[in-house]
Interface confidence: low
Amino acid sequence: YDFTNCDFEKIKAAYLSTISKDLITYMSGTKSTEFNNTVSCSNRPHCLTEIQSLTFNPTAGCASLAKEMFAMKTKAALAIWCPGYSETQINATQAMKKARKSKVTTNKCLEQVSQLQGLWRRFNRPLLKQQ
């Protein structure tokens, strides 16, 4: 999906008002220094591409983020503020339903959500300082 046509300010507002708090809730009890940020993004469309990938694509050791509160709110924000996004996600949604039966918080998931927090922060201050 091409995220360049999204309403970035509206997505930013959704992040600041709710998504950020849900990410903090998910990470509660985890030290902020526990994980190193290894994923970055160079501008807002790129950040959304990385955020979508980490939030909705199951990875080894963490197949369980899609039904977390922050993920559902992220999906809603992208669906509302990115034209045509919903249509591209129909197949992905079906795959998520099959892959995900119960919520399991693993250390890998905590690491992944820590990366997401970094990407969202970068989304709010997007310009990459070094390539």
Partner: antibody
Framework: EVQLVQSGAEVKKPGASVKVSCKAS????????MHWVKQAPGQGLEWIGM????????TLIQKFKDKATLTVDKSTSTAYMELSSLRSEDTAVYYC??????????WGQGTTVTVSS | DIQMTQSPSSLSASVGDRVTITCRAS??????LAWYQQKPGKAPKLLVY???TLAEGVPSRFSGSVSGTDFTLTISSLQPEDFATYYC?????????FGGGTKVEIK
Amino acid sequence: EVQLVQSGAEVKKPGASVKVSCKASGYTFTTYWMHWVKQAPGQGLEWIGMIDPSDSETTLIQKFKDKATLTVDKSTSTAYMELSSLRSEDTAVYYCARTLDGYYDYWGQGTTVTVSS
Amino acid sequence: DIQMTQSPSSLSASVGDRVTITCRASENIYSYLAWYQQKPGKAPKLLVYFAKTLAEGVPSRFSGSVSGTDFTLTISSLQPEDFATYYCQHHYGTPWTFGGGTKVEIK
């Protein structure tokens, strides 16, 4: 209304320094990066570098690392570029421009720096 | 560094003509390209960003497109005020680089 207002034209002798200012208004100064761009007479546009007004972190291309110093004064919403050890090839129009995603939606009017003995 | 090769360097056209300017990136920059218009003695003006998004207040006769690493700025019907120099610029990451410019002159 967003505005970037640059200081006036300067004529300097070789070896001297010059400090160009860029005063921002109409937006939150620390939200956007400030970039500087050089345009030599009859030539194209050349990126010099950028500064993040929120923390003064700067990035300069190699060519300008010993030539340009970028600073900001948050209290006056002003960005500065100082050029040192001026030579004839530094004669150019210098622009400041603000950016969030790397493209420049607002530019200063440009400051002409002439280096001549 | 990413190199931006812009062509042609100059072109002559008449009012009402369709004009196409191209820019090629030396590597994949996705849709992260902007186009600017510059008139003599003035600062550049943003026309298009993210390869195809028209900047605020820019007439709809301007449009941008992308195919791989090739980017195009099209002016569908050239107007007298469009005679100027046009630059492309990638905004994929540092260092930002510009194309060499295309001067659009009156035929």
